[in-house]
């Protein structure tokens, strides 16, 4: 922003009314009137170039300083070329001196040179030569000087002529202010420019109405330079929640719009599934049945719990069930869907039911599932199971209702026994097996069927209540096909795979463990 000038003294504008003091009185400087563009102009001039040793003073009236700390003095003047005078006037000069004196009171006509301090010697950039003078084409010079810091109530300026031909057309004394400013939604008051060139006056700004310093942000500050220019902005204000920046002000969000926090962003339209907001809203309330999770930004549409997993199937495989489902048709507008699987078992005889989480095994933890399938094992035979798959999202906890689908399955068989060969000899095979512990109580006996490989006409059966058996009276170096099946009160369970086990040849005799 451009500096603002406050004029303390303007000779040209005063129309010769100022009545400055000349010393010595009646000699040297003289007030003259001229006509330029049909307007009278006044000037103080002096032209004692032929006489030697000139010391002519022109002192301004006392100027009240007011709030100025540094003043700027702008001079407009002409100087005639010494060579334009006969003989070059050996005592002729082409410069004059500028002085100032501070005081707390007006000394009136009491003029004392010793009180004045020299500011500078003023030399012209261009001098007016004879031909210019005769053609009334004078060369006007403009020079500016500054003085500061000033501390007294007022001051005088003085011009010392030492033998030049000078006409002083304008003397303008002013000080500079940094103008009132609105920047970054902060108001900076009009500030007097400092007096020391290297230093900048720090000025605190105040946030405009409905603007605030953001949390953790810096208070708005600007620096007012000597020349009245604002420099180095620091910090800023932002329109508070519910308001947006319109030019240099903060305006309330229109109805149907909101702004959640102090920021540079404009007000946003209320998102989907919200109610129309009033003017100046910081958020938009959710429609009935829609919610915001604590971590949801205000700009996100309100959402609702998902519908149930849409399709669900339970495929029984022995004492295992694979549950597969598809995502909800209605995600509720969210992507953070997880699934939970729960299990209930019912005894067909009594119709009694209860949870079965403790007795079954899931292929992965059954809560917070992101995949859409899970395998449940260690199911008991001859039991009815109902599986519930629930879909949840980030707002499900805000409602009491649940979104679930159920599937029922009856386990009719035990899981096939896992069979291994424990030892063998030329005439025997020692076989053991296992089934999941939850199913063991349902098993009455185990049936071991074996026959020679390639002989489909005859087979042998052994029944036992234990988990192992030794098959004797076998032929040496012969492969036998062995299968184990659990027998329950309700009938046969699932049979194991058919295993091929070979007895030892006579050369490799001895009971060798495998």
């Amino acid at each position: 922003a451009q500096g603002k000038e406050v004029v303390l003294l303007d000779f040209a504008a005063a129309g010769g009314e100022l009545g400055w003091l000349t010393h010595p009185y009646g000699k040297g400087w003289d007030l003259m009137q001229n006509i330029m563009n049909d307007m009278p102009i006044y000037m103080y001039s002096v032209c004692n170039v032929m006489s030697g040793d000139q010391d002519n003073w022109l002192r301004t009236n006392w100027v009240y300083r007011g709030e100025a700390e540094r003043i700027f003095i702008e001079l407009k003047f002409t100087v005639r070329d010494c060579n334009s005078f006969p003989g070059g006037a050996s005592s002729c000069k082409e410069t004059f001196n500028l002085y100032y004196a501070e005081s707390d009171l007006d000394y009136g006509t009491n003029f004392q040179k010793r009180l004045f301090t020299k500011i500078d010697t003023i030399a012209p950039d261009e001098i007016t030569v004879s031909s210019d003078f005769e053609a009334r084409h004078v060369k006007l010079n403009v020079e500016e000087r500054s003085v500061g810091p000033l501390t007294r109530k007022g001051f005088y300026l003085a011009f010392q002529d030492i033998g030049a031909c000078v006409a002083l057309l304008s003397v303008r004394v002013y000080y500079k202010k940094c103008p009132e400013l609105l920047q970054g939604l902060a108001h900076f008051p009009e500030t007097i420019a400092g007096s020391d060139a290297p230093s900048l006056a720090t000025v605190a700004g105040t946030c405009v109405d409905h603007a605030v310093v953001p949390p953790g942000g810096e208070e708005p500050r600007m620096h007012c330079a000597v020349d009245g220019e604002w420099l180095v902005p620091i910090g800023q204000c932002l329109c508070q929640a519910g308001y947006e920046k319109v030019e240099d002000a903060c305006q309330a969000c229109s109805p149907g719009f909101f702004k959640f926090e102090a920021s540079e962003s404009p007000c946003l339209e209320c998102p989907e599934h919200t109610l129309p907001s009033p003017e100046g809203a910081t958020s938009c309330e959710c429609e009935e049945g829609f919610f915001r999770a604590p971590q949801d930004p205000a700009s996100m549409p309100c959402t609702r719990p998902p519908s149930a997993p849409h399709y669900l199937t339970a495929v029984g495989m022995g004492a295992k069930v694979e549950l597969r489902w598809t995502p909800p048709q209605d995600s509720g507008g969210r992507e953070d869907i997880v699934y939970s699987v729960t299990c209930e078992q019912c005894w067909p005889e009594s119709g009694e039911c209860g949870p079965c989480e403790a007795s079954v095994r899931y292929s992965e933890p059954p809560h917070g599932l992101t995949r859409t399938s899970v395998t449940v094992s260690d199911l008991e035979p001859h039991m009815n199971y109902t599986f519930t798959v629930e879909a949840r999202n980030g707002v499900s906890g805000l409602v009491t209702s649940r979104s679930f689908r159920t599937a029922s399955v009856s386990i009719n068989q035990t899981e096939p026994p896992k069979v291994r060969l424990e030892g063998r000899s030329t005439t025997s095979l020692s076989v053991s097996w296992s089934i999941p512990p939850p199913q063991q109580s349902r098993v009455w006996k185990y049936e071991v069927t074996y026959r020679k490989k390639g002989d489909s006409n005859s087979y042998n059966v052994r029944r036992t209540e234990g988990f192992s058996v030794t098959l004797d009276d076998l032929a040496p170096d012969t492969t036998y096909l062995v299968q184990v099946q659990a027998l329950t009160q309700e009938g046969q369970g699932a049979g194991s795979k058919v295993h091929e086990f070979q007895t030892l040849s006579p050369e490799g005799s001895g009971n060798l463990a495998v």
Epitope: G289, S307, A308, H310, Y311, L312, T313, V315, R324, T326, P327, Q329, D330, T372, S373, R405, T406, A407
Partner: antibody, heavy 120, light 107 residues
Framework: EVQLVESGGGLVKPGGSLKLSCEAS????????MYWVRQTPEKRLEWVAT????????HYLDSVKGRFTISRDNAQNNLYLQMSSLKSDDTAMYYC?????????????WGQGTLVTVSA | DIVMTQSHKFMSTSVGDRVRITCKAS??????VAWYQQKPGQSPKLLIY???TRHTGVPDRFTGSGSGTDYSLTISSVQAEDLALYYC?????????FGGGTKLEIK
């Protein structure tokens, strides 16, 4: 026995409107999501719209969004498809469909269809 | 959207033959694939769902299989009444999408 009977099809000019109906019987209508599926003259099958059992959720094929509205009247066991700003691409046989019992299977039951022809 | 691709628009077979119609999904659909049969002048009818489960009343000559992105419908011994259009459909996520169809023709 599950029965779905569509009606309301016919010849309509581009930009025109039509409302299809599907009357359901033989099951508890308010227990099921319902669908409209169409079959283009080239025999391509295309799901068009879904409505939840209570009517609170609807979902549409992108190309019909804003032009078609699926709705239901659970008291009257009726499903509707309001079609507006019709285009020649909407020419198809329109079927209403229902999932299987307890949502174990998709589109287990279909109506006989109603033909919509969009032509100048 | 999930794209279902049936690479054969037509398949020609003889009564008693074994025929396999294939379908490929553009992403894993976790076996949520259904097969529909549409005879001329009729509505589509569900044959298979969840990739391999036969719908009520469907003859056991129809078998579905597959996982991930690759699925197939096999008719073990084609009958004259199997002349129809066969569509696969993913019922995993909306929009539920269908394959372009395979027309089974009897030689």
């Amino acid at each position: 026995e599950v029965q779905l009977v569509e009606s309301g099809g016919g010849l309509v000019k581009p930009g025109g409107s039509l409302k299809l109906s599907c009357e359901a019987s033989g099951f508890t209508f308010s227990d099921y999501y319902m669908y409209w599926v169409r079959q283009t003259p080239e025999k391509r099958l295309e799901w068009v719209a879904t409505i939840s059992d209570d009517g609170s959720f609807t979902h549409y094929l992108d190309s019909v969004k804003g032009r078609f509205t699926i709705s239901r009247d659970n008291a009257q066991n009726n499903l509707y498809l309001q079609m507006s700003s019709l285009k020649s691409d909407d020419t198809a046989m329109y079927y209403c469909a229902r999932d299987g019992y307890r949502y174990d299977r998709p589109f287990a039951y279909w109506g006989q269809g109603t033909l919509v022809t969009v032509s100048a | 959207d999930i794209v279902m691709t049936q690479s054969h628009k037509f398949m020609s077979t003889s009564v008693g033959d074994r025929v396999r119609i294939t379908c490929k999904a553009s992403q894993d659909v976790n076996t949520a694939v259904a097969w529909y049969q549409q005879k001329p002048g009729q509505s589509p009818k569900l044959l298979i769902y969840w990739a391999s489960t036969r719908h009520t009343g469907v003859p056991d000559r129809f078998t579905g299989s597959g996982s991930g992105t690759d699925y197939s419908l096999t008719i073990s011994s084609v009958q004259a009444e199997d002349l129809a259009l066969y569509y696969c459909q993913q019922h995993y996520s909306t929009p539920y999408t269908f394959g372009g169809g395979t027309k089974l023709e009897i030689k």
